[in-house]
C-alpha cells in the first residue's frame, strides 16, 4: 500500500501528538548526548515539514523516505563530530547504509548521569507550568538512556506519567500519592526496556527465524485455543512490528502495532477469550494490555502429540515437504499444551526434535530411530525445573540481598574478567528472580524464572559486546540464543584467570557511606565483594561471608561514631588487614 508521501501518511495515521512523541523518541535514541532543546527544535522542524506534506503530498521532498528525511535532519546537528566522534561519518553515507550506521552507534550504556528525582513540589510546579515540555523531557530522558525502548510502549508510559502528576499534584499528600507511582513506572520501565532489548538482539543477532520461533511458542501458550494459522498470522505481524521498532522505524512500528491491536480485537473469537477487557481501552492502553494478557485456558480435549510427531509413519515425509512449517506446528502444539514451560525450554525441545529428524530421516529405519525422541526431552525439562527449585530454596533461605551475593560470587568466579559494575548490575538483577518468581505456584515458576533470566543475561551480552573481555562470555552469548542460560549455568571456575592484585584504594571507605540509601550501600558492599573474589577467586563462601560480616559491622560502627571520617580512617586499614589475613 504505497503513498505519495510516507511522512504525510504516518502523520495522518498517528495524529500530531503521537507523531511528535515518536519522532522525539527516535532522535533521542540515535543522538543520545544531544541536549533536550536541540531535539525539540529538530522535532518541531520535522513536524512542520510533515504538515506541509499533509496539505500537499506533491510538495518538495515529501516523497522522500522517512530514513532520508530523519537522517538528513540528524546530520544538520552542528556538534556531531565533537560529540559523537566517528558516528559523524554516518552522514557521508547514503540510505539505507546511513541508517544502519546510526543503528550500530546506539550505545546501550551511555555515559549519562543517573536521573535525580527533584522534590515533589518542584516537579508539580514544572508539570503545571508547562505540561507539554515536562512530558517531552520524560520521553527524551528515558529514550536516550534506553536506545531500544519499545517506542509505542514508551508513549504509554508517558501517558501514565502524565496521569500520575495530574492526579497527585492535586492530592493532600502529594509525595505519598506520587512517589510510589513513579517508583512503579521506573521499575516497570526498566523491565520493559530489558525485555525489548532481548527482542531486538534476537532479531539482529539471530535473524527473524529465531524471533518467529520465540513468538510462535509464546503466542501458542497465550492463545492455546487459536488455530495454528491464526497464531502464524499474529507471529508474522508481530515480527514486522518489532523488526521496525528495532530498526529505528518507529512511526511504521507504532502504526503497525495499532493495526495489530485492531485486528486482534476484531477477531477475539478465533484468538482468545481473555482479550475482551483489553479491547474496550484506548489505543496505547489496549496495545499494552494485549501484550500482557494472561494465558487463555487450554482446550480440554487436546490429543497426545505422539500420534502425529512420533508414531505416524509420515513424520519424515511431512518434515521434508515443509520443514519450517512442520517444526512450527510441532512448537505450536507443544507450547499450547505447556504453559508451565519456559519459552526457552520449548525452543530447546523444538531444536532437539529438529536435530533428531535431521539424523533419523536419513537413517535406514527412520521410525525406529526417532521412536524414543520424547524420552530424550526428559533431561532437557528436568534441568530448568531443578535449577528453579534449587535457586528458590536458596532465595528462601538467604533473602534477596544475600541471594544476590551468592550469585555475585558465582558469576565472578565464572567470568572474573567482566567489569565489576557489570557483574554487580547483572547479579543484582539475576537475584531479583527470587522475589519475582519464587512466590508463584509451581506451574508458573519456570516460565517466570527462565524467561526473566534470559532477559537479564541478554543485558550481560549487550554490555560485553561493547567491551569484550571474556571468550567464555562471547561464546555463551553468540553460539545459541536458546542455550544462553544453560551455557552460563554450565560455566565453571576460570582456572586460567590470574588473580587481580590487591589494591587498598578499592577497599578504602569514607563517611559518605553513611548518607547513602540502603540500595546504594548494598551496591557499595557488593562492589567490594566482587573485588574480593577477583583478588581471591578460590576463597570459600565462609571466608567471604566472614569478611562481608566484618565489613557490615565496621561500616555500622563508623556510621554511629561522632567523628565518622576519623573512624573510617582509623578502622578502615584494620578491616583491610584483617580481611587479607582471613583470605590468606
Amino acid at each position: 500500500d504505497t503513498h505519495k508521501s510516507e511522512v504525510a501518511h504516518r502523520f495522518k495515521d498517528l495524529g500530531e501528538e503521537h507523531f511528535k512523541g515518536l519522532v522525539l523518541v527516535a532522535f533521542s535514541q540515535y543522538l543520545q548526548q544531544c541536549p533536550f532543546e536541540e531535539h525539540v527544535k529538530l522535532v518541531n522542524e520535522v513536524t512542520e515539514f510533515a504538515k506541509t506534506c499533509v496539505a500537499d503530498e506533491s510538495a518538495e521532498n515529501c516523497d522522500k523516505s522517512l530514513h532520508t528525511l530523519f537522517g538528513d535532519k540528524l546530520c544538520t546537528v552542528a556538534t556531531l563530530r565533537e560529540t559523537y566522534g566517528e558516528m559523524a561519518d554516518c552522514c557521508a553515507k547514503q540510505e539505507p547504509e546511513r541508517n544502519e550506521c546510526f543503528l550500530q552507534h546506539k550505545d546501550d550504556n551511555p555515559n549519562l548521569p543517573p536521573l535525580v528525582r527533584p522534590e515533589v513540589d518542584v516537579m508539580c510546579t514544572a508539570f503545571h507550568d508547562n505540561e507539554a515540555t515536562f512530558l517531552k523531557k520524560y520521553l527524551y530522558e528515558v529514550a536516550r538512556r534506553h536506545p531500544y525502548f519499545y517506542a509505542p510502549e514508551l508513549l504509554f508510559f508517558a501517558a501514565r506519567y502524565k496521569a500520575a502528576f495530574a492526579e497527585c499534584c492535586q492530592a493532600a499528600d502529594k509525595a505519598a500519592c506520587l512517589l510510589p507511582k513513579l517508583d512503579e513506572l521506573r521499575d516497570e520501565g526498566k523491565a520493559s526496556s530489558a525485555k525489548q532489548r532481548l527482542k531486538c538482539a534476537s532479531l539482529q543477532k539471530f535473524g527473524d527465524r529465531a524471533f518467529k520461533a520465540w513468538a510462535v511458542a509464546r503466542l501458542s501458550q497465550k492463545f492455546p485455543k487459536a488455530e495454528f494459522a491464526e497464531v502464524s498470522k499474529l507471529v508474522t505481524d508481530l515480527t514486522k512490528v518489532h523488526t521496525e521498532c528495532c530498526h529505528g522505524d518507529l512511526l511504521e512500528c507504532a502504526d503497525d502495532r495499532a493495526d495489530l491491536a485492531k485486528y486482534m480485537c476484531e477477531n477475539q473469537d478465533s484468538i482468545s477469550s481473555k482479550l475482551k477487557e483489553c479491547c474496550d481501552k484506548p489505543l496505547l492502553e489496549k496495545s499494552h494490555c494485549l501484550a500482557e494478557v494472561e494465558n487463555d485456558e487450554m482446550p480440554a480435549d487436546l490429543p497426545s502429540l505422539a500420534a502425529d510427531y512420533v508414531e505416524s509413519k509420515d513424520v519424515c515425509k511431512n518434515y521434508a515437504e515443509a520443514k519450517d512449517v512442520f517444526l512450527g506446528m510441532f512448537l505450536y502444539e507443544y507450547a499450547r499444551r505447556h504453559p508451565d514451560y519456559s519459552v526457552m525450554l520449548l525452543l530447546r525441545l523444538a531444536k532437539a526434535y529438529e536435530a533428531t529428524l535431521e539424523k533419523c530421516c536419513a537413517a535406514a529405519d527412520p521410525h525406529e530411530c526417532y521412536a524414543k525422541v520424547f524420552d530424550e526431552f526428559q533431561p532437557l525439562v528436568e534441568e530448568p525445573q531443578n535449577l528453579v527449585k534449587q535457586n528458590c530454596e536458596l532465595f528462601e533461605q538467604l533473602g534477596e540481598y544475600k541471594f544476590q551475593n551468592a550469585l555475585l560470587v558465582r558469576y565472578t568466579k565464572k567470568v572474573p574478567q567482566v567489569s565489576t559494575p557489570t557483574l554487580v548490575e547483572v547479579s543484582r538483577n539475576l537475584g531479583k528472580v527470587g522475589a519475582k518468581c519464587c512466590k508463584l505456584p509451581e506451574a508458573k515458576r519456570m516460565p517466570c524464572a527462565e524467561d526473566y533470566l534470559s532477559v537479564v543475561l541478554n543485558r550481560l551480552c549487550v554490555l560485553h559486546e561493547k567491551t569484550p573481555v571474556s571468550e567464555k562470555v562471547t561464546k555463551c552469548c553468540t553460539e545459541s540464543l536458546v542455550n544462553r542460560r544453560p551455557c552460563f549455568s554450565a560455566l565453571e571456575l576460570d582456572e586460567a584467570y590470574v588473580p587481580k592484585a590487591f589494591n587498598a584504594e578499592t577497599f578504602t571507605f569514607h563517611a559518605d557511606m553513611c548518607t547513602l540509601s540502603e540500595k546504594e550501600k548494598q551496591v557499595k558492599k557488593q562492589t567490594a565483594l566482587v573485588e574480593l573474589v577477583k583478588h581471591k577467586p578460590k576463597a570459600t563462601k565462609e571466608q567471604l561471608k566472614g569478611v562481608m560480616d566484618n565489613f557490615a559491622a565496621f561500616v555500622e560502627k563508623c556510621c554511629k561514631a561522632d567523628d565518622k571520617e576519623a573512624c573510617f580512617a582509623e578502622e578502615g586499614p584494620k578491616f583491610v588487614a584483617a580481611s587479607q589475613a582471613a583470605l590468606a
Partner: nanobody
C-alpha cells in the same frame, strides 16, 4: 575447616548395589548442601546428586534417577549414596562435596571436597 572422607567403594557386578558413605569432621554438616560427583577416566567431573540442608530436597542427574538415592544423617555428620542396579557406565571415582549454598551440578559451587572412592562395575 570441613574435612570429608568417602568410603564404601569397590568392585561390583552389573546389576549389583553399593552404599557409599561420606563422613564429615571439623564442622557440623547441618548448614551445608551436600552432593556426590563422579569422574570417569579421561572425562570431566560430573554431578550425580545433591541434598539440601534439611534433607527435604534432593536432585539427581538424569542418568541415575530411580537407581541412586542420597540421604543425610546430620546427627552422625554423614551423607550416604545408595547405588542400585549399577551399570558399567557408572564406573568412576565418586567424590563427596559440601557447600553453604551449593547449587546442584556446578562443580565450582562446592567449596569442600573429599579425596574420592573408586567404584568399578564389571559386565
Amino acid at each position: 575447616q570441613l574435612q570429608l572422607v568417602e568410603s564404601g567403594g569397590g568392585l561390583v557386578q552389573a546389576g549389583g548395589s553399593l552404599r557409599l558413605s561420606c563422613a564429615a569432621s571439623g564442622r557440623a554438616i547441618s548448614s551445608y548442601v551436600m552432593a556426590w560427583f563422579r569422574q570417569a577416566p579421561g572425562k570431566e567431573r560430573e554431578f550425580v546428586t545433591s541434598i539440601n540442608w534439611s534433607g527435604g530436597s534432593t536432585y539427581y542427574a538424569h542418568s541415575v534417577k530411580g537407581r541412586f538415592t542420597i540421604s543425610r544423617d546430620n546427627a552422625k555428620n554423614t551423607v550416604y549414596l545408595q547405588m542400585n542396579t549399577l551399570k558399567p557406565e557408572d564406573t568412576a571415582v565418586y567424590y563427596c562435596a559440601a557447600d553453604l549454598y551449593g547449587l546442584g551440578y556446578e562443580v565450582m559451587s562446592y567449596d569442600y571436597w573429599g579425596q574420592g572412592t573408586q567404584v568399578t562395575v564389571s559386565s
